[in-house]
């Protein structure tokens, strides 16, 4: 297929990415499912300057983004290396916290009111970022 | 006219394979996620699958995971369904629908179905 | 899976009369709650999305309202065209999930 040249409807445009801001909460994982059925994966940060962009956007408001460890280490959903890559938590955190009394630890990470990250309960209903490559967002994959 | 029609049902033994296509019209088909969606007679409705627009993310109920594939060629304008190792408990009306913009779980536009008989 | 429960499971209505149906939902789904028409041997036809919102060409006497486990659909003034099944659809979560619907009759 031909690549995209401009986002999606009511998608934002920044740095060669497409951004969609929800409005409305979901757990993690159906966050994960939503940015998933647009062809596109929950917010992965790379950089301040994307970490502004977002935060800008979604305002002082609890954001889900596609970082979590879930099955151990921390891990970006579209493979980008975490250890190497940009950071920008809270003070103290992560800290996989199990006072809630939700069962669990904590172990999907969120953009706070002040935009740095903590990790949470994946269960909370919280708003999300979707993303996609603008050179991804219109290839077509093969057909099996 | 906005329109989306199913084929392929049919009778098929206990163990069987048939594959359902669905011929979509009058909309920019690779923009919309598309969902099948089947009712066993006198049931209520049961989503099966659904798959993004470009095809690259499909997404299963548990009891046709393994067993059922969704797919979808946009320069064709047309969804499958291919169903293998096919259960007495699969007969249904199969529906192809088209989800919302942003609302992908609501289908605004349904085929007229396809009968699956699943029987020996 | 999100359960889905409907009620009443049959009613009967005068044309003119004014019904009500509810829907819940096993857990918090905000407002992605759906509701469908279906007529014998015909597909699903949308009326209501995201709870409350009505679909293009739907007519105003249907509406929906709710949020978080307990929706409400609503027929202000019942027309004869209007016997059918109606069901109430999460999309919350996957897998999506549909009740098992509410037929409506004329008395």
């Known amino acids: 297929g031909s690549e995209r040249t401009c986002c999606p409807v009511n998608w934002v445009e920044h740095e060669r990415s497409c951004y969609w801001f929800s409005r409305s909460g979901k757990a993690w994982a159906d966050a994960d499912n939503y940015c998933r059925l647009e062809d596109a994966h929950l917010v992965v940060v790379t950089s301040w300057e994307e970490q502004k962009f977002v935060q800008h956007h979604i305002g002082p408001v609890n954001t889900w983004m596609g970082l979590h460890d879930q099955n151990g280490p921390w891990k970006w959903v579209d493979g980008t290396d975490y250890e190497t890559g940009f950071k920008n938590w809270r003070p103290e955190q992560p800290d996989d916290w199990y006072g809630h009394g939700l069962g669990g630890g904590e172990d999907c990470a969120h953009f706070t009111d002040d935009g740095r990250w903590n990790d949470d309960v994946c269960q909370r209903p919280y708003r999300w970022v979707c993303e996609t490559e603008l050179d991804k967002a219109s290839q077509e994959p093969p057909l099996l | 006219e906005v329109q989306l029609l199913e084929s392929g049902g049919g009778l098929v033994q206990p163990g069987g394979s048939l594959s359902l296509s669905c011929a979509a019209s009058?909309?920019?088909?690779?923009?919309?996620?598309m969902s099948w969606v089947r009712q066993a007679p006198g049931k209520g409705l049961e989503w099966v699958s659904a798959?993004?627009?470009?095809?690259?993310?499909?997404f299963y109920t548990d009891s046709v995971k393994g067993r059922f594939t969704i797919s979808r060629d946009n320069s064709k304008n047309t969804l499958y369904l291919q169903m293998n190792s096919l259960r007495a408990e699969d007969t249904a009306v199969y529906y192809c629908?088209?989800?919302?913009?942003?609302?992908?779980?609501?289908?605004?536009?349904w085929g007229q179905g396809t009968m699956v008989t699943v029987s020996s | 899976d999100i359960q889905m429960t409907q009620s009443p499971s049959s009613l009967s209505a005068s044309v003119g009369d004014r019904v009500t149906i509810t829907c819940q939902a096993s857990?918090?789904?905000?407002?992605?709650l759906n509701w469908y028409q279906q007529k014998p041997g015909k597909a699903p036809k949308l009326l209501i999305y995201?709870?409350?919102n009505l679909e293009t060409g739907v007519p105003s006497r249907f509406s929906g309202s709710g949020s978080g486990t307990d929706f409400t659909f609503t027929i202000s003034c019942v027309h004869p065209e209007d016997i059918a099944t109606y069901l109430c659809?999460?999309?919350?979560?996957?897998?999506?999930?549909f009740g098992p619907g509410t037929t409506v009759d004329i008395k």
């Open positions: 009058g909309f920019t088909f690779r923009s919309y996620v």
């Open positions: 995201d709870a409350s």
């Open positions: 629908a088209k989800g919302i913009t942003g609302s992908h779980g609501a289908f605004d536009i």
């Open positions: 857990r918090d789904i905000t407002f992605y």
């Open positions: 659809q999460q999309y919350d979560n996957l897998p999506f999930t």
């Open positions: 798959i993004s627009g470009r095809g690259s993310n499909t």
